[in-house]
């Protein structure tokens, strides 16, 4: 089956004809399967010692692992990651704002391992088990 | 400035050039800003009263709106939202399998909106003010 | 509460120097900066300079050579101090504060007339 | 130093009116703009800042929305108190710039 963009996902749904398309069993999974996918991420998560200060923008598109494994079991994590360096406005209170450089680590590449504990059904993770 | 695919961010930093490359100012900015993007989100998320059941894949991947909006004062909220219909499988303990269609809700027009109390700040939003 | 006050004369010769006193209360000027803006009669708003927080200070191109703005941290004063006034200076000079965005409060205004 | 146009300078509107007032930056300024409110005699107000962060005390019939180089000021219902003048200011690059202002008038 060709693949289908999921911003088209919400238009074929809603297309008007009486016949709702589906989206194949197929295209399902194989969005939904571990990979390395776009995730905004707070900058003072990464550097929350810089917590009094604000950044411009707030957050960073980064890609990490996520997805689902297809065994409760397993789940999705990173097993090679790149450093990515992005220039952002740092505002002091009061001050004058700045450029800075910051560098945040991406998931390159992502895989489906076991849960250290084979306990905690984990149905969907964000490279980190659900509880 | 070009934009560049965030697959490749972390590549152009480990070139293996003494310089890093550091993605400029205007492509963070445009890349973080409140819009509609891929997740993937647990099935018994959407569906609880099915948690009972499993479900392959246990997540699908949906488009919700989540960026930043440049003030901790605003947060990214859906204004536009479409059904989108996919084929699962459902697992019942001990039983066979079965296919089914479920119904999702995806986020197709973002906007920044005033967070209701101008207090709390909200540095990265996934349309949800961060406590 | 937070307040700024201005104080500073409402008549000035021609040639002479302009000089504004914004004194704050209810905040730090270690924290926020202070910005200096001008209305003259009939105009818009116009943006002349700024004491940030750090003390670094920030001019519009038109006026560099002819402001400056200075601050004393321990008094929450800051100073506004232009020179070689003319007539079209006249009009009404405001401070306001600034943390991370808009100005969010401003000084009573100080009205100034150019005449001899 | 980057521009700040105000499409209209004045507009004639009646009490309970939807009034959208525009502004446009010469460049691209990420959301650091702001509205303000004057009234005569009286200093601006700010009312809204990072392109539609309603400050405290501002009546939520204000409303901002906007990015990249065009911005705008909504009133949903326009009270009698809302008669003023209403400027536009971008604060990504010294110099901060102001718009020319647009007044409102009841008709």
């Known amino acids: 089956l060709p693949a289908v963009p999921p911003q088209q996902w919400a238009l074929s749904a809603g297309n008007g004809s009486s016949e709702v398309e589906v989206v194949p069993f197929q295209e399902v999974w194989g969005r939904s399967y571990c990979r390395a996918l776009e995730r905004l991420v707070d900058v003072v998560s990464e550097y929350p010692s810089e917590v009094e200060h604000m950044f411009s923008p707030s957050c960073v598109s980064l890609l990490r692992c996520t997805g689902c494994c297809g065994d409760e079991n397993l789940h999705c994590v990173p097993v090679e990651t790149a450093n990515v360096t992005m220039q952002l406005l740092k505002i002091r209170s009061g001050d004058r704002p700045s450029y800075v450089e910051l560098t945040f680590s991406q998931h390159v590449r992502c895989e489906c391992r076991p849960l250290r504990e084979k306990m905690k059904p984990e149905r969907c993770g964000d490279a980190v088990p659900r509880r | 400035l070009p934009a560049v695919p965030p697959q490749q961010w972390a590549l152009s930093a480990g070139n293996g050039s003494s310089e890093v490359e550091v993605v400029p100012f205007q492509e963070v900015w445009g890349r973080s800003y409140c819009r509609a993007l891929e997740r993937l989100v647990d099935v018994v998320s959407e569906y609880p009263s099915e948690v009972e059941h499993m479900f392959s894949p246990s997540c699908v991947s949906l488009l919700r709106c989540t960026g930043c909006c440049g003030d901790e004062n605003l947060h990214c909220v859906p204004v536009e939202t479409a059904n989108v219909t996919m084929q699962l499988l459902k697992i019942r303990s001990g039983d066979r399998p079965s296919y089914v269609e479920l119904t999702f809700s995806q986020h197709v027009r973002c906007e920044c909106r005033p967070l209701r109390e101008k207090m709390k700040p909200e540095r990265c939003g996934d349309a949800v003010p961060r406590r | 509460q937070v307040q700024l006050k201005q104080s500073g004369p409402g008549l000035v010769q021609p040639s002479q120097s302009l000089s504004i006193t914004c004194t704050v209360s209810g905040f730090s000027l270690t924290t926020y900066g202070i910005h200096w803006v001008r209305q003259s009669p009939g105009k818009g708003l116009e943006w002349l300079g700024v004491m940030w927080s750090g003390g670094d200070t920030d001019y519009d191109a038109a006026f560099i050579s002819r402001l400056s703005i200075s601050k004393d941290n321990s008094k929450s004063q800051v100073f506004f101090k232009m020179n070689s006034l003319q007539a079209n200076d006249t009009g009404i000079y405001y401070c306001?504060?600034?943390?991370?965005?808009?100005?969010?409060?401003w000084g009573q205004g100080t009205s100034v007339t150019v005449s001899s | 130093a980057i521009q700040m146009t105000q499409s209209s300078s004045s507009f004639s509107v009646s009490l309970g009116d939807r009034v959208t007032i525009t502004c446009k930056a010469s460049?691209?300024?990420?959301?650091?703009f702001a509205w303000y409110q004057q009234k005569p005699g009286n200093a601006p107000r700010l009312l809204i800042s990072?392109?539609?962060s309603l400050e405290a005390g501002v009546p939520s019939r204000f409303s901002g929305s906007g990015s990249g180089q065009d911005y705008t000021l909504s009133i949903t219902s326009l009270q009698t108190e809302d008669v003023a003048t209403y400027y536009c200011?971008?604060?990504?690059?010294?110099?901060?710039?102001f718009g020319g202002g647009t007044k409102l008038e009841i008709k």
């Open positions: 990072g392109a539609a």
């Open positions: 306001a504060r600034y943390r991370f965005y808009g100005m969010d409060y």
């Open positions: 200011q971008q604060y990504w690059s010294t110099p901060w710039t």
């Open positions: 460049e691209d300024i990420y959301n650091r």
